[in-house]
Interface confidence: low
């Protein structure tokens, strides 16, 4: 039988009259154009609404668009378009939502062709009221917010000037011209690169990279012949053209670019590519890209210094074509990445690592599924995920894997189960363990949604008809419930929910037809009311995280630490609550080697955990690059992971020598670097 | 030297308790685990469970799961075993034994075991009414 | 549990002799196997861990093979000293599980 349909599944008591008294329908008195949506703050209730539609008119296209305002999580929206003077917003520049809890929007207006700079409405009371703004500059991208202070905007402008402004976005003031690329650092500190000749296209790999530390009142010029640059955790990234060629390579710093070291990883070309695929204050996850046109690269995982690097995962799917790949960190449970593969025979398959890209393995097969045909061996397979590549090739995907940090180990995904991902209709699986096991949990697509921590899964089947039917689960996708919303199917377009998945109420979003007009329309159901009361200590079991061998002395061991969790019991129908905190118990393992990468010049064959010298590098001395001067690595083979806590047992030894030598790097020393003030 | 060096001999009745004491010398305390192996009169070995001194996490042989706790100070290098509601049939000399089992690289071909390297001189417990 | 058997129970075998010394366990456990030498009123002594390596200061004459769920421990030429009880140990999978025990005697 299909999920959910055998006898086992308990009906929750009297739901549908429970989600009638909480479901809230709003009609927007609008013509249907495109819809935005962005929730200001966090648990604060408030969403802002913005549609748009477009007149083709014979000369030009007119615009029109509405701001709306909802403070009860989208049951009840009230039109503020009158706030911002009924001004068309531009919905390119989204809505500009302040960090954290700052309750600050700024949204950019279209202003008309002749006006001398743009114009944005700006709010720091969640959205109540707005303040008119004209800027001195047309601007070519969204305002971006300082992390640390929620007053202190930059914009790039329409002439590539650098504007910056300390009082959110009062006064704006120019503090660099011909800029390509300008991001928020640590510390109020702004990076950006500038061209000297013509344009930022043309002096591509000859950029300079620059860095304010005072919001421009005075600058550090920090890397020449430069790329492009980017920001992964504690790291900054610069890609640099070689002196004699047409490759670059990687340099890193994590000083804000004082010292700069060439990274161990192989360089690139001009048709290739590096990129970040995931960074934290440990370690890097770097995509390098294969020559040629191959749609694939090699994934490298760094050192804790960014700067020695193991290959992690070959064939990496990565397509050059729109850059699509189906990298995914699966946030509910720690040191779990999942990924494509591009096979020899051009098939797609889906790879797992639980341990932070130390291995990869395929995932297992459901135990509720058969294989499919993509499979040589009917009882053989795995389960392959689909993601943003799936998405871009327009298969029968409508969302990508979700997992939330605060539903412990539960991962949603649309999957196929054969050999290699299948162009069929997926169905959707779920893994309550973070990805070691898979059930499926709906048949065919849908679009889903995790509430209270994981104590609801919604979903709704994607269809190409209208539609008035949710589905609902209170045990982690086992046993699902219908709900009929409506008594009218609308179109629909998206579900939304306040992102961290604390909140109980989910908004569906759609559009009615009839035969002259067409309006935008949400149903926001509220499941308090479901899970009636809140959860006790006993509505709790203790849960090892990564245990795969209850026997086995080391179970759960990852990254030389086990966490015990306190997790809702499937059985229990009770509110985990907007205030719920994960709850972890964290104990200390025994170090092994595999607790430890292949250090630079070593590799570990395959089924083995033990790192042996390259051949290539046999009886060479190790010399690499750091902070510009040369090193030699004194090392048996091993370094311990980034963020590995693990104490005892093995320890190889491992030592690092300076060789009183400068790097054959063009890159500019420490001693050679300018600075300049305002 | 590496050394295990046991609390004496213990004599009780049945239903009782008794709490044998392992204290380490000559290596790093917290770099392996301990493991607690019992052998009765004239039979072979009998492994109880494990202690990983670093977090004090146990694992018991389900035969003695519910009467057995283990524990360790790291502040004096000692892991204590106690077994509870003693019968005759636990009559018999019980030895810590170091088990570097901890530094074994789990891979998927099995992990490398290193053998209980270093043994305590054993403790004698006779339970009698 | 994984079972350990071991055999023979008992071997006789005179000094200067060969002893070779069989356990089987119940389901693989690859090369996690250990072996020791006990002698009367003395604790067990490792003698060969991985199925095949030497612990520190065990001499020559002793070697350990097999891995899975058969393996043999050797005594190339018999001395005097190693006449006693042998025992295998698993820890592929918890509970850690000893055989029974081969005694080496005196033929």
């Known amino acids: 039988s299909a999920p959910g349909e055998d006898e086992e599944c308990g009906r929750v008591r009297d739901f549908v009259a429970k989600l009638a008294n909480n479901t809230h329908q709003h009609v927007f008195d609008d013509l249907r154009g495109s819809v935005s949506l962005s929730w200001v703050g966090d648990s604060t209730g408030v969403i802002l609404v913005l549609t748009t539609f477009h007149v083709p008119l014979v000369i030009m296209t007119f615009g029109q668009s509405k701001l709306y305002r909802s403070e009860d999580y989208g049951k009840n929206f009230k039109d503020i378009t009158d706030l911002i003077n009924n001004t068309f917003i531009r919905t390119e520049f989204g809505m500009a939502i302040g960090p954290e809890n700052s309750g600050k929007v700024v949204l950019t207006a279209e202003v008309s062709g002749g006006s001398r700079g743009g114009r944005i409405f700006r709010s720091s009371d969640f959205a109540k009221n707005f303040v008119q703004t004209d800027l001195p500059f047309h601007p070519l991208t969204q305002m971006m917010y300082s992390p640390q202070n929620s007053d202190y905007l930059l914009a790039l402008s329409t002439e590539n000037g650098l504007w910056v402004s300390k009082n959110f976005g009062g006064k704006w003031e120019e503090i660099h011209k011909a800029v390509c690329l300008a991001k928020w650092g640590s510390d109020n500190t702004i990076f950006f690169t500038t061209y000297a000749n013509g344009s930022c296209k043309a002096d591509l790999g000859a950029l300079e990279l620059w860095r304010t530390s005072d919001l421009g009142k005075s600058f550090k010029t920090i890397g020449v012949k430069i790329y492009s640059f980017g920001l992964g955790g504690r790291f900054l990234f610069a890609s640099v053209m070689a002196d004699k060629d047409t490759t670059r390579r990687i340099h890193v710093s994590t000083d804000q670019g004082d010292t700069w070291s060439m990274a161990q990883l192989p360089s690139v070309g001009q048709e290739q590519f590096y990129s970040i695929l995931a960074a934290n204050d440990d370690m890097v996850f770097m995509h390098v890209d294969e020559p040629g046109d191959t749609g694939f690269g090699t994934i490298f995982t760094s050192d804790d210094r960014g700067i020695v690097y193991s290959k992690s995962l070959d064939r990496h799917l990565y397509t050059t074509t729109g850059g699509e790949t189906d990298f995914t960190n699966v946030t509910s449970l720690r040191g779990v990445y999942i990924t494509s593969v591009l096979s020899e025979d051009n098939s797609i398959q889906t790879m797992i690592t639980f341990d932070q890209g130390g291995r990869w393995t395929h995932l297992r097969k459901p135990e509720n599924s058969e294989c499919d045909a993509t499979a040589k061996n009917k009882n053989e397979c795995s389960l392959h995920i689909h993601a943003s590549y799936s998405i871009s090739q327009k298969l029968n995907v409508p969302m990508a894997p979700l997992s939330e940090p605060n539903a412990v180990g539960i991962v949603i995904a649309h999957g196929s189960v054969g050999d290699a991902i299948s162009v069929m209709v997926p169905d959707v699986y779920i893994s309550d363990d973070g990805g070691y096991s898979w059930t499926k949990m709906l048949e065919g697509p849908h679009y889903y949604t995790i509430l209270d921590s994981g104590g609801i899964i919604v979903a709704i089947e994607h269809s190409s008809r209208p539609i008035n039917v949710i589905k609902f689960s209170t045990d982690e996708g086992q046993c699902w419930q219908t709900y009929t919303f409506t008594r009218d199917p609308i179109y629909f377009t998206g579900l939304a929910s306040e992102p961290g998945a604390r909140s109980m109420n989910i908004s569906i979003w759609g559009f009615t037809e009839s035969f002259l007009t067409s309006q935008w329309v949400s149903y926001t159901i509220d499941f308090k009311d479901i899970l009636e009361r809140n959860c006790e200590e006993k509505d709790y079991t203790i849960w090892l995280a990564h245990s795969t061998d209850p026997e086995d002395y080391e179970d759960g061991c990852i990254l030389g630490y086990k966490e015990q969790f306190l997790r809702l019991r499937k059985s229990s129908v009770c509110q985990n609550g907007r205030d719920y905190v994960v709850t972890k118990q964290p104990s200390i393992c025994l170090c092994s080697l595999e607790d430890f990468l292949c250090d630079f010049g070593y590799y570990r064959p395959e089924n083995d955990s033990k790192c042996v010298e390259q051949p290539e590098l046999k009886g060479h001395d190790l010399e690499f690059c750091l902070y510009g001067r040369e090193e030699h690595l004194t090392t048996n083979g091993y370094r311990k992971i980034p963020g590995d806590k693990c104490q005892g047992g093995v320890n190889p030894v491992r030592e690092v020598k300076d060789l009183k030598k400068k790097c054959t790097s063009n890159f500019l020393s420490p001693e050679k670097q300018n600075s300049k003030s305002n | 030297q590496v050394q295990l060096v046991q609390s004496g001999a213990e004599v009780r009745k049945p239903g009782a308790s008794v709490k044998v004491s392992c204290k380490a010398s000559?290596?790093?305390?917290?770099?392996?685990?301990m493991s607690w192996v019992r052998q009765a009169p004239g039979q072979g070995l009998e492994w109880m469970g494990i202690i990983n001194p670093i977090g004090g996490s146990t694992s018991y042989a389900q035969k003695f799961q519910g009467r057995v706790t283990m524990t360790r100070d790291t502040s004096t290098s000692t892991v204590y075993m106690e077994l509870s509601s003693l019968r005759s049939e636990d009559t018999a000399v019980y030895y810590c034994?170091?088990?570097?089992?901890?530094?074994?690289?789990?891979?998927?071909?099995?992990?490398?075991?290193?053998?209980?390297?270093?043994w305590g001189q054993g403790t004698t417990v006779t339970v009698s009414s | 549990e994984i079972v350990m058997t071991q055999s023979p129970a008992t071997l006789s075998v005179s000094p200067g002799e060969r002893a070779t010394l069989s356990c089987r366990a119940s389901?693989?456990?690859?090369?996690?196997l250990a072996w020791y030498q006990q002698k009367p009123g003395q604790a067990p002594r490792l003698l060969i861990y991985?199925?095949?390596t030497r612990a520190t200061g065990i001499p020559a004459r002793f070697s350990g093979s097999g891995s899975g769920t058969e393996f043999t421990l050797t005594i190339s030429s018999l001395q005097s000293e190693d006449f006693a009880v042998y025992y295998c140990q698993q820890a592929r999978l918890g509970p850690w599980t000893f055989g029974g025990g081969t005694k080496v005697e005196i033929k």
């Open positions: 034994a170091r088990d570097p089992s901890g530094i074994a690289a789990a891979f998927p071909a099995g992990r490398y075991y290193y053998g209980m390297d270093v």
């Open positions: 000559g290596y790093t305390f917290t770099k392996y685990y």
């Open positions: 991985g199925a095949s």
């Open positions: 389901q693989s456990v690859s090369s996690n």
